[in-house]
């Protein structure tokens, strides 16, 4: 058993049918010695008397808010949560496996640049009685500071019969140098509590591996005289690290017909312009990627050919 | 400690091309190592990230773009001094700080070259003959060093009398390639910045 926060405790259980569970001793936070009784949640049934209460915690029915009283007055509370270990593996019931980029990916994180700011998000089908708390650091043995905000519900989607809820959090490394070569990964730890179930999820990454630039901005077309060709131009996104000559991007320019089946023409360039043939009803899209370290491509920025 | 903006004219910078080749070569070699050594811990998540140049060179600090010198987090490291004459400095206006930067890059390349050659000698003794260093990558390191053209003492190739542990050598190769790829990215960024300045 360990303390998650004041008066909230996590009991780690080896979770299998007929498991013996864990013996837990609760102590009433009071100078009083006599006349103390214990109850669980809203029930008025007295579970025991005395300054300490010993309980065998086996299932969720044994978890909850234990309260010690004296003469009708509440003295203190202890909330017991359960953390299930199933055959040596901690349970992952609360969050959805996003399966990208690999199985057992519960937290996904992205950064728009090298400033040390990043966003993580996760999915769940649970809509109520759910709380998250997020901590982060650079490295784990001698951790350096990363400050995270509060996790917020960022999207709701309908997936088949189920509703899916997306939560996200923004974090910022306290003293980040955009040019630094990372040797210690960023660690992100999310505590999730659903009713009386506790779970924790972690992700470890280098900022360089989660970079996903914003799409190029100011995408414009300039028709070339007496030609079906157009000059496409764009600019670096505002959120990208500067100077751009140091933090350079490379670009992919795509001409896509109305029909998805039509052949796509693609051009790769390090410049912020390209000359392409603009077909009728086609659209031109441009996306960006770090020129030197191949992390994710940005989303496409698009303009119609007409 | 930082790169001045007034540096050689665009196109006058012979090292840019070599640094791009270097990044391509090390990335290809790393990809090959990850595929060939699939049953070894060779991915970025599995290896320890060690930098063999730590406390010996200070490339990131010495080559910091002028715009980042206002960022205190980028300025908290040691000073290191280097030999300062090189042929990539294709302009008389080049400052001492830029010379220090290019000299630091040269020292990096020299250190990695020695490590890779020593490692290759060990890998050639492996009866499994599972993986060797790409000669193209070694050649590209050499070409960039020649383009930088710094006078520096030659570092003798490390020779080892004990029987090599091939498992450990292959893991060390992965660690070295990951670190060298990261340094090659920094070198490419620096060369691109200097070329544009």
């Amino acid at each position: 058993i360990w303390e998650l926060k004041k008066d909230v405790y996590v009991v780690e259980l080896d979770w299998y049918p007929d498991a013996p569970g864990e013996m837990v001793v609760l102590t009433c936070d009071t100078p009083e010695e006599d006349g103390i009784t214990w109850t669980l949640d809203q029930s008025s049934e007295v579970l025991g008397s005395g300054k300490t209460l010993t309980i065998q915690v086996k299932e969720f029915g044994d978890a909850g808010q234990y309260t010690c009283h004296k003469g009708g007055e509440v003295l203190s509370h202890s909330l017991l949560l359960l953390h299930k270990k199933e055959d040596g593996i901690w349970s992952t019931d609360i969050l959805k496996d996003q399966k990208e980029p690999k199985n057992k990916t519960f937290l996904r994180c992205e950064a728009k640049n090298y400033s040390g700011r990043f966003t993580c998000w996760w999915l769940t089908t649970i809509s109520t009685d759910l709380t998250f708390s997020v901590k982060s650091s650079r490295g784990s043995s001698d951790p350096q500071g990363v400050t995270c905000g509060a996790a917020t519900l960022s999207a709701e989607r309908v997936r088949g019969d189920n509703k899916e809820y997306e939560y996200s959090v923004e974090c910022q490394e306290d003293s980040a140098c955009p040019a630094a070569e990372e040797s210690l990964p960023i660690e992100v730890m999310v505590d999730a509590v659903h009713k009386l179930k506790y779970e924790n999820y972690t992700s470890s990454f280098f900022i360089r591996d989660i970079i996903k630039p914003d799409p190029p901005k100011n995408l414009q077309l300039k028709p070339l005289k007496n030609s079906r060709q157009v000059e496409v131009s764009w600019e670096y996104p505002d959120t990208w690290s500067t100077p751009h000559s140091y933090f350079s991007l490379t670009f992919c320019v795509q001409v896509q017909g109305k029909s998805k089946r039509e052949k796509k023409d693609r051009v790769f360039t390090d410049k912020t312009s390209a000359t392409v043939i603009c077909r009728k009803n086609a659209s031109i899209s441009v996306r960006a990627q770090d020129r030197y370290y191949s992390s994710s491509w940005s989303e496409w920025a698009s303009v119609p050919c007409s | 400690r930082n790169l001045p903006v007034a540096t050689p004219d665009p196109g006058m910078f012979p090292c840019l091309h070599h640094s791009q080749n270097l990044l391509r070569a090390v990335s290809n070699m790393l990809q090959k190592a990850r595929q060939t050594l699939e049953f070894y811990p060779c991915t970025s998540e599995e290896i320890d990230h060690e930098d063999i140049t730590k406390d010996k060179t200070s490339t990131v600090e010495a080559c910091l773009p002028l715009e980042l010198t206002k960022n205190e987090s980028c300025l908290n490291s040691r000073e290191t001094s280097f030999i300062t004459n090189g042929s990539c400095l294709a302009s008389r206006k080049t400052s001492f700080m830029m010379a220090l930067c290019l000299s630091s890059i040269y020292e990096d390349l020299k250190m990695y070259q020695v490590e890779f050659k020593t490692m290759n000698a060990k890998l050639l003794m492996d009866p499994k003959r599972q993986i060797f260093l790409d000669q193209n990558m070694l050649a590209v390191i050499d070409e960039l060093m020649q383009a930088l053209n710094f006078n520096s003492e030659t570092v003798p190739q490390k020779s080892s009398l004990e029987e090599p542990d091939f498992y450990k050598t292959k893991i060390k190769l992965c660690i070295l390639l990951h670190a060298f790829r990261i340094r090659a990215v920094t070198i490419d960024r620096v060369m691109s910045y200097l070329n544009a300045s």
Epitope: D14, Y16, P17, D18, E86, D87, I89, D93, K104 | P41
Partner: antibody, heavy 115, light 111 residues
Framework: QVQLVQSGGGVVQPGRSLRLSCAAS????????MHWVRQAPGKGLEWVAF????????YYADSVKGRFTISRDNSKNTLYLQMKSLRAEDTAVYYC????????WGQGTMVTVSS | SYVLTQPPSVSGTPGQRVTISCSGG????????VKWYQQLPGTAPKLLIY???QRPSGVPDRFSGSKSGTSASLAITGVQAEDEADYYC????????????FGTGTKVTVL
Amino acid sequence: QVQLVQSGGGVVQPGRSLRLSCAASGFTFSSYGMHWVRQAPGKGLEWVAFIRYDGSNKYYADSVKGRFTISRDNSKNTLYLQMKSLRAEDTAVYYCATHGSQDNWGQGTMVTVSS
Amino acid sequence: SYVLTQPPSVSGTPGQRVTISCSGGRSNIGSNTVKWYQQLPGTAPKLLIYGNDQRPSGVPDRFSGSKSGTSASLAITGVQAEDEADYYCQSYDRGFTGSRVFGTGTKVTVL
């Protein structure tokens, strides 16, 4: 006392279907994940499928993916394995088992796929 | 399916120490716990060891398990006639409850 009682095995022709059941008692069935494991005659144990305690996630071995469906009815304390497009190589004793460090197994039920 | 490799058979005389190896990889034994089962002819497997080296109550202490790196082993110290059976190791792949992997099985013969 944890008990898993299996039923539904038998002889079936290739291409046909069969549904196995596993009735659980002596524990809170709705709190635990469940597995199906099989053993071909004279061969070793092969994991077949797993279902989470609430039925929200199901996982299958490649050899049965798309043909077998694991399901559960927590109100009836019963685990099921629906087997379709059966092949000769599916002939085996099928066991249901609880998920956890100390697991419990059913007695097994024989499925023979033969023409 | 992922398979853990065991020797097909091992044998020993009563009272001898018998060990069965179980070899896997980084994604299964290397990163998860190991179980061992005993299966007597015509019966369901019986759990002998869980969590690499833990014995459920009722399992004689002559059975012990251990794990090192990507391999595990089961030792029977002072093997007895009633230990003649098939033995299987089991783990998970990539910390994934939905991917139980079994060993190929070892027949223990008591001479």
